[in-house]
């Protein structure tokens, strides 16, 4: 059911046996979402494993613009600029939380979902499989 | 203001440009534990800019735990396993959405909370101030 | 300190059903799940399925699905498992487990179902 | 499923003897492995999270190492109250634990 908020302390449920659907209070200490990671540091650029950010928007999930990590290249940078192709950057990922609108364009109905992001890159030591 | 839901098919809210509290479905799209990859990689002892996990417990938050990328070297690993202090391992942070109970203890009210978490670490060439 | 109460054993006869309850004292369930893991005599540890009580999320281990419900009551801090159409080989100790989605780090006293005509 | 296989599956030792088990995961499970201890008649109870960290109240004699699949659970100096039986256990899916290692006494 609908969480209609009742006279008590706590906002009250029509289903009393688990609340489905609850309040969120948006709220957010820190709420300027949108923030450029390139603005915050410029290690996209300056690593071994260099990435671009790719903007990945969507209207109808909150936060709407999420910035996403694709490494530049398949190995990683030496100081000579060069790629060294026996290492290898990788993206790393982490899983976030998101609230997706839901029924479609209702400015203040949600649904919570996970999602994983690629948040930068770093270089790793390849693992060489070995044939007998 | 609180959102409460009127006639039309979507809950009405006070505020017109971003609603301040929103109803929240809580089935998850991605419930099942399996398919949440928790970075089963290595990468965090293969990379040249190797860190450590360190759990962020907190009970009244949801995650609950929360791991904490803490790069275990000022410089980064080179392929004879020593470290490189003419380049910099620095911390990949993300900005996360955590779920918190607000008022506490109350089943069906919470606030969305952003909390900056570093996920990882990355190998970067140093800035070198010059001076005049 | 967190503390995992069980309810105490049973005895059922095969396709029957049986609850068990978990009950969290010395605090609320937090935004933990609650899992449960079950144990057949002189055997090894096998995990059903968990519940996050603050949101009602359940995720069951492919064996169990379809025989099996988690549910919680956050009003009491209880959770309950449900394992139906039982046989011979479900006897053994249900415990539930704290779970933070990464390990188990408070457990039940556990309580042992026997199933036997 | 993720298979996890603990060695061996016994181990006799005395008092003050270094203990080591190790567990092989089916697939890489990265650091998600944790090592409980189970004494008879009693419930699991929770010595190393996260490969090697050390869970809070356990004693420093407990370590554990390892990452991707293979693990190692070590007791350096085996005292009379660790005569128990050892699972190691991963998350980097659905929950699924080893066999068991039963440390008794020679």
């Known amino acids: 059911g609908i969480a209609i908020p009742r006279n008590s302390g706590c906002p009250n449920s029509e289903d009393k046996n688990f609340p489905r659907t609850v309040m969120v209070n948006l709220n957010i200490h820190n709420r300027n979402t949108s923030t450029n990671p390139k603005r915050s540091s410029d290690y996209y650029n300056r690593s071994t494993s260099p990435w671009n950010l790719h903007r990945n928007e969507d209207p109808e999930r909150y936060p709407s613009v999420i910035w996403e990590a694709k490494c530049r290249h398949l190995g990683c940078v030496k100081a000579d600029g060069n790629v060294d192709y026996h290492m290898n950057s990788v993206p790393i990922q982490q899983e976030i939380l998101v609230l997706r609108r839901e029924p479609r364009h209702c400015p203040n109905s949600f649904r919570l979902e996970k999602i994983l992001v690629s948040v930068g890159c770093t270089c790793v030591t390849p693992i060489v499989h070995h044939v007998a | 203001g609180i959102a409460i839901p009127r006639n039309s098919g979507c809950p009405n809210s006070e505020d017109k440009n971003f609603p301040r509290t929103v109803m929240v479905n809580l089935n998850i799209h991605n419930r099942n534990t399996s398919t949440n990859p928790k970075r089963s990689s290595d990468y965090y002892n293969r990379s040249t800019s190797p860190w450590n996990l360190h759990r962020n417990e907190d009970p009244e938050r949801y995650p609950s735990v929360i791991w904490e990328a803490k790069c275990r070297h000022l410089g980064c690993v080179k392929a004879d396993g020593n470290v490189d202090y003419h380049m910099n391992s620095v911390p990949i942070q993300q900005e996360i959405l955590v779920l918190r109970r607000e008022p506490r203890h109350c089943p069906n009210s919470f606030r969305l909370e952003k909390i900056l978490v570093s996920v990882g670490c990355t190998c970067v060439t140093p800035i070198v101030h010059h001076v005049a | 300190q967190v503390q995992l109460v069980q309810s105490g054993a049973e005895v059922k006869k095969p396709g029957s059903s049986v609850k068990v309850s978990c009950k969290a004292s010395g605090g609320t369930f937090s935004s933990y799940a609650i899992s449960w893991v079950r144990q057949a005599p002189g055997q090894g540890l096998e995990w059903m399925g968990s519940?996050?009580?603050?949101?009602?999320?359940?995720n069951y281990a492919q064996k169990f699905q379809g025989r099996v419900t988690i549910t919680a009551d956050e009003s009491t801090s209880t959770a309950y498992m449900e394992l139906s159409s039982l046989r011979s080989e479900d006897t053994a100790v249900y415990y539930c487990a704290r779970d933070s989605e990464y390990y188990f780090d408070h457990w039940g006293q556990g309580t042992l179902v026997t199933v036997s005509s | 499923d993720i298979q996890m296989t603990q060695s061996p599956s016994s181990v006799s030792a005395s008092v003050g003897d270094r203990v080591t088990i190790t567990c092989r995961a089916s697939?890489?499970?990265?650091?998600?492995l944790n090592w409980y201890q189970q004494k008879p008649g009693k419930a699991p109870k929770l010595l190393i999270y996260a490969a090697s960290s050390l869970q809070s109240g356990v004693p420093s004699r407990f370590s554990g190492s390892g990452s991707g699949t293979d693990f190692t659970l070590t007791i350096s100096s085996l005292q009379p109250e660790d005569f128990a039986t050892y699972y190691c256990q991963q998350y980097s899916d659905d929950p699924t634990f080893g066999q068991g290692t039963k440390v008794e006494i020679k």
């Open positions: 697939q890489g499970i990265s650091n998600w």
């Open positions: 519940i996050i009580p603050w949101f009602g999320w359940t």
